[in-house]
């Protein structure tokens, strides 16, 4: 599949960081999604957990980001073996654990996809 | 020893510029989103503008009454934030602080820890 | 533009509880971070994200927000606290920052 460049990871980065500064109330009344695997494929992963949170505004760019990044078409109810299907965490968690990860993969230029 | 230490504070006429400069030690401070915060004399604190770190974006953002005047900078290379302060005012006299931005703190390696500079004077008379 | 609001000033009694209130339409999702200003000196963060307090910062010193209103408690208010205090926090949007008008502690020695 296509790997994000350089400049797609810093866009996803800096709408990570916008929807999470100084937020302490719950983003998006505190829905649930599955924990994934922080590691190659993790866009698709990532993807495929959020899209099963609906009518939720502040996350709506960073769903078509990482549609942009993901190279199949993901539906909601759509799970790969990527995800820890046993452990489900806030949303406002996930976000932040995907930030942390992509920040680290765009520091050591390794943009997995 | 962490600080921040200003410079470039001075007497300017209305109308003028003046670039102020805040140099950075003891921190990552490529890794900080910084501040500019301003106190007019006998007044309150106001917050002036922020920047974040370039992995967050470097993205800039500035409270209304100078937005389209002045502008923030940073040279991590120089672990060194800057202000460019054009069309400057009256109303612009204050003592100017940089300080660590406390909502990046979050993002960077210093969450729970606050540097100030010692403020540097800008006088904006005729 | 967004604004959060505190009291002019606030008096009490050595080893009496101090309480500043700072208001502010975000303030429910929003963190608030509080700062103490002695005379001639910059500002010290005395507690961040409503109620943490920084290292080195007096256990006296505790924050806690509840809706649109945060609030600084100084438990067995001392000389030494007298000083400026400032709410700072953001917009809704997290982008813009502000701070209070602030308050003046005075402790009546």
């Known amino acids: 599949g296509p790997v994000p460049p350089s400049t797609a990871l810093r866009e996803l980065i800096e709408e990570l960081v916008n929807i999470t500064q100084n937020q302490k109330a719950p983003l998006c009344n505190g829905s649930m999604v599955w924990s994934i695997n922080l590691t190659a494929g993790m866009y698709c992963a990532a993807l495929e957990s959020l899209i099963n949170v609906s009518g939720c505004s502040a996350i709506e760019k960073t769903q078509r980001m990482l549609s942009g990044f993901c190279p199949h078409k993901v539906s909601a109810g759509q799970f790969s073996s990527l995800h820890v299907r046993d452990t489900k965490i806030e949303v406002a968690h996930f976000i932040t654990k995907l930030l942390s990860y992509t920040k680290q993969l765009f520091r050591h230029g390794q943009q997995f996809n | 020893e962490v600080q921040l230490v200003e410079s470039g504070g001075g007497l300017v006429k209305p109308g003028g510029s003046l670039r102020l400069s805040c140099a950075a030690s003891?921190?990552?401070?490529?890794?900080?989103?910084m501040s500019w915060v301003r106190q007019a004399p006998g007044k309150g604190l106001e917050w002036v503008g922020r920047?974040?770190?370039?992995?967050?974006?470097?993205?800039?953002n500035y409270a209304a009454p100078v937005k389209g005047r002045f502008t923030i900078s940073r040279d991590d290379s120089k672990n060194t934030l800057y202000l460019q302060m054009n069309s400057l005012k009256t109303e612009d006299t204050a003592v100017y602080y940089c300080?660590?931005?406390?909502?990046?703190?979050?993002?960077?390696?210093?969450?729970?820890?606050?540097?100030w500079g010692q403020g540097t004077t800008v006088t904006v008379s005729s | 533009s967004y604004e959060l609001t505190q009291p002019p000033s606030v008096s009490v009694s050595p080893g009496q509880t101090a309480r500043i209130t700072c208001s502010g339409d975000?303030?429910?999702?929003?963190?608030a971070y509080w700062y103490q200003q002695k005379s001639g000196q910059a500002p010290v963060l005395v507690i961040y994200?409503?109620?943490k307090r920084p290292s080195g910062i007096p256990e006296r010193f505790s924050g806690s927000s509840s809706g649109t209103m945060a609030t600084l408690t100084i438990s067995g208010a001392q000389v030494e606290d007298e000083a400026d205090y400032y709410c700072h926090s953001t917009d809704s949007s997290g982008n813009h920052g502000v701070f209070g008008g602030g308050t003046k502690l005075t402790v009546l020695g």
């Open positions: 003891g921190f990552t401070f490529s890794n900080a989103w």
């Open positions: 920047i974040r770190s370039e992995i967050d974006g470097g993205t800039t």
């Open positions: 300080a660590t931005d406390q909502v990046g703190a979050y993002y960077g390696d210093y969450y729970g820890m606050d540097v």
């Open positions: 994200e409503d109620s």
């Open positions: 975000a303030l429910p999702e929003k963190y």
